[in-house]
Interface confidence: medium
């Protein structure tokens, strides 16, 4: 029986050309986090391994920055970045916890600036 829960930023929006922080937090468990994967649909964006540190997928290294913490910063956003993002926490002994974030990248200043974790 797994006890933990993932809190995420939920649905967020940002302007084209801007940046956004994707953030998840694992709570209500003492399980040890061994790795966090960040994925967009079926594409791996980045890995933060407890022992080996960060690895950014080569195809995203120009637009993805590690952190803050176990989060991920997306830069130079395009409309094509709109979609679902997943944080996958690999823990021991519980296994995997997955959180979902939906990002909408807007063409102009109609982005909701009140979204949490957004970089101005």
């Amino acid at each position: 029986m797994m006890t933990g829960t993932i809190e995420t930023t939920g649905n967020i929006s940002a302007e084209k050309g801007g940046s956004i922080i994707l953030q998840c937090h694992l709570s209500s468990t003492t399980a040890q986090v061994t790795q966090v994967n960040w994925e967009q649909q079926d594409q791996l964006l980045a890995i933060c391994n407890a022992d080996l540190g960060w690895h950014i997928s080569p195809s995203f290294k120009d637009r993805v920055a590690p952190g803050p913490g176990l989060g991920l910063t997306l830069q130079s956003l395009t409309v094509n970045d709109t979609g679902e993002y997943f944080c996958i926490y690999h823990t021991y002994p519980d296994g995997t916890y997955t959180g979902r974030i939906f990002l909408e990248v807007l063409e102009s200043s109609v982005a909701e600036h009140g979204a949490r974790f957004q970089i101005p």
């Epitope: 391994n49 690999h90 021991y92």
Partner: antibody
């Protein structure tokens, strides 16, 4: 070397609680999780649950929430599996198995010889 | 819970030939780094013995005729060349989540 010692057999009357033991030696006892696995004759393995040997934190298979209680005695390096209100369905071989953590991917690297539990009046 | 489907349920292989056992999981048990899949051998009256960890890594002391591969949901255990002492039941097991689950087993007979 690592050893997990279990009694070979236990006989219990239906409805009477039973406590199975697993004594560990040959390694740093409190650094691991200990698992319990049930195997009925001619059948596969059913994972019951696991207990951390330093802080007694447990994870249980939901199918065993009302059946199994896991405890640990650090002073004797022994873990226990208590089965409540046993019936003939609980007659099986019960193994303890140490779980080794490898970058979060864990596996059972050492097993006890198993205790054959017979529930009979 | 993750369902582990092993096939075949039983297998008869001639001495020196290849034995192939399949294990399929109801969801992926792999990350980009590891597969949380392990293989055990069990003989009558004995506890299971770890053969392969993390889909393809041979446990220390296990003969090199045992090998395994796979990722995601499809995994395979191979024994080649099969020896008489390999007669046993083989099980796959995942450690992707709680609860851990096992395959139903494949009984290998040598002729």
């Amino acid at each position: 070397q690592v050893q997990l010692q279990q009694p070979g057999a236990e006989l219990v009357r239906p409805g009477a609680s039973v406590k199975l033991s697993c004594k560990a030696s040959g390694y740093s006892f409190t650094s691991y999780w200990m698992n319990w696995v049930k195997q009925r004759p001619g059948q596969g393995h059913e994972w019951i649950g696991m207990i951390h040997l330093s802080n007694s934190e447990t994870r249980l298979n939901q199918n065993f929430l009302d059946k199994a209680t896991l405890t640990v005695d650090k002073s004797s390096s022994t873990v226990y599996l208590q089965l409540s209100s046993p019936t003939s369905e609980d007659s099986a071989v019960y193994y303890c198995a140490r779980e080794r953590d490898y970058y979060g991917s864990s596996y059972f690297d050492y097993w006890g010889q198993g205790t054959t539990l017979t529930v009979s009046s | 819970d993750i369902v582990m489907t092993q096939s075949p349920a039983s297998l008869v292989v001639s001495l020196g030939q290849r034995a192939t056992i399949s294990c399929r999981t109801s969801q992926s048990v792999s990350t980009s780094s590891y597969s949380y899949m392990h293989w055990y051998q069990q003989k009558p009256g004995q506890p299971p013995k770890l053969l392969i960890k993390n889909a393809s890594n041979l446990e220390s002391g296990v003969p090199a005729r045992f090998s395994a591969s796979g990722s995601g949901t499809d995994f395979t255990l191979n024994i080649h060349p099969v020896e008489e002492e390999d007669a046993a039941t083989y099980y796959c097991q995942h450690s992707w989540e709680i609860p851990r689950t096992f395959g139903g087993g494949t009984k290998l007979e040598i002729k």
